[in-house]
């Protein structure tokens, strides 16, 4: 997290806000609900209280405007700048302005007013942008899904550094951003994508370029807004410029940023039995056109060319790949080796000699 220079903050805990005008995109009650919920994000974790005024001067004046709207920080039409807010202080201090050339919504369409407002009110209270891609105060808008919003830990640490904790946090689970060099790090899925490596963990993925050591961290939804926050397995089919992503009983085919029509499909359409609830890992072999799908202690082999499951499967993981354990969290193939991830460990397995040649920490893939 980051606070503003000179640690700008309010010297009182009871703050007022006023909605000066409304967007035509939403009903008045939807707008009021979004702002109320956005303030609650911050009051839940601090001693701050927010009271709405219907007229007069409030600490935080909220308005919608377009282009030049009276503060010499003009908006720019659709997309680009969405909103801005001033840090704590007199006059403009604390005020939040929303660009009415955007389409504001209470859903995933357009820009979600609650999410943008919660971010802006962070500025109104003294938080600057965070470098943590998982933080609400990260400067890039990402719709995080319909489920109950949980303020990320980085934002909690930031706001509590200014105002301290509240009496009781009604939602004490604050998601942490994974640390790539945590020795206990386990991974959810790994796939190549157009020459890069994508390494998934929780609602994030690291993107690793072959010529770089520093992996860049992204929210999965910043790349693919329609995908679930977390995924179970992934593999690339390079000759078709597609990657396949699995979550629960569903899977998606993606071309770059775009989901192919007809997806998601059910994993049973691949020929998996109905009792298989999820795929834990998947890896594709371009030279044979085969894909290994792991679930529980079993492995299936799918023929991507003929779109059928190979006979003689499923088989036990321990029988086909002795020594790697009886489950696979994530897997990928490179230069004749399969890399199996099981908890905080990865096994380098030679396809040619059919044996484990190295055992390494899982996060050595991230150069830790």
């Amino acid at each position: 997290y980051n606070v503003f220079p000179r640690t700008l903050k309010w010297s009182k805990m009871n703050l007022t806000y006023r909605i000066v005008n409304y967007t035509p995109d939403m009903t008045h009650s939807e707008v009021e609900k979004a702002f109320k919920k956005a303030f609650k994000v911050w009051s839940d974790v601090t001693p701050l209280n927010f009271t709405r005024l219907h007229d007069g001067i409030a600490d935080i004046m909220i308005s919608f405007g377009i282009k030049e709207h009276g503060d010499f920080y003009p908006f720019d039409g659709p997309s680009g700048l969405l909103a801005h807010a001033f840090p704590p202080g007199p006059n403009y201090g604390g005020d939040a302005h929303f660009d009415d050339d955007e389409t504001w919504t209470s859903s995933s369409k357009g820009y979600n007013l609650f999410l943008v407002a919660a971010h802006e009110f962070g500025h109104s209270l003294g938080l600057d942008h965070s470098k943590d891609p998982g933080a609400l105060m990260f400067p890039i808008y990402t719709y995080t899904g319909k489920s109950h919003f949980m303020l990320p830990d980085d934002d909690v640490q930031g706001i509590q550094s200014l105002y301290g904790p509240g009496d009781e946090d009604p939602n004490p689970k604050h998601p942490k951003t994974p640390d790539k060099c945590d020795p206990s790090l386990s991974l959810d899925a790994i796939t190549s994508l157009r020459g890069e490596t994508m390494i998934f963990k929780d609602r994030f993925f690291w993107r690793l370029h072959p010529q770089q050591v520093d992996a860049e961290l992204f929210l999965t939804k910043s790349f693919w807004p329609e995908l679930p926050n977390r995924i179970d397995a992934a593999y690339e089919h390079p000759s078709h410029d597609l990657i396949f992503i699995f979550r629960g009983r569903k899977f998606w085919a993606l071309n770059g940023y775009d989901i192919l029509e007809g997806y998601p499909k059910k994993i049973s359409e691949l020929g998996l039995p109905k009792e298989v609830k999820k795929i834990s890992a998947a890896v594709h072999f371009e030279d044979t056109g085969k894909t290994l799908l792991f679930s529980g202690n079993q492995v299936w082999r799918y023929d991507d060319t003929n779109h059928i499951m190979d006979k003689d499967y499923p088989r036990l993981i321990e029988e086909d790949f002795p020594g790697i354990g009886d489950k696979v969290d994530a897997v990928y193939e490179k230069n004749g080796y399969i890399y199996f991830f099981n908890g905080p460990i990865q096994f380098e397995y030679s396809i040619w000699s059919n044996r484990i040649v190295r055992v390494m920490p899982a996060n050595s893939i991230l150069w830790c």
């Epitope: 997309s79 940023y257 775009d258 192919l260 029509e261």
Partner: nanobody, 114 residues
């Protein structure tokens, strides 16, 4: 319906630069990914660069650091700035909106000579 028209192709020496443009007609351009693909004679069409609706970029390993993709939703235009061009960059470059199942331009020829 989105129509795409590429421009900016041409001939250039090794190490030179070109800027390709992709003009889109149709109001849904801003809601689709914007990509550049290329096809060299006798080869398959290959991905070059892409930019999401949220302006997150993705490059083929062979062009990363040399090519820059950008978009202007208000103008309905996409761009590909190509620097340090190599003879192996010679191809017809196609603009795409929305991925493989989306919309395609007719292409613009880029020739890099040594």
């Amino acid at each position: 319906e989105v129509q795409l028209v590429e421009s900016g192709g041409g001939s250039v020496q090794t190490g030179g630069s070109l800027r390709l443009s992709c003009a889109a007609s149709g109001s849904t351009f801003s809601r689709r990914s914007m990509n550049w693909y290329r096809q060299a004679p006798g080869k398959q069409r290959e991905f070059v660069a892409g930019i999401s609706t949220g302006r997150i970029t993705n490059y083929a390993v062979s062009v990363k650091g040399r090519f820059t993709i950008s978009r202007d939703n208000a103008e309905g235009t996409g761009y590909l700035q190509m620097n340090s061009l190599k003879p192996e960059d010679t191809a017809v470059y196609y603009c795409n909106a929305g991925g493989l199942q989306g919309y395609w331009g007719l292409g613009t020829q880029v020739t890099v000579s040594s």
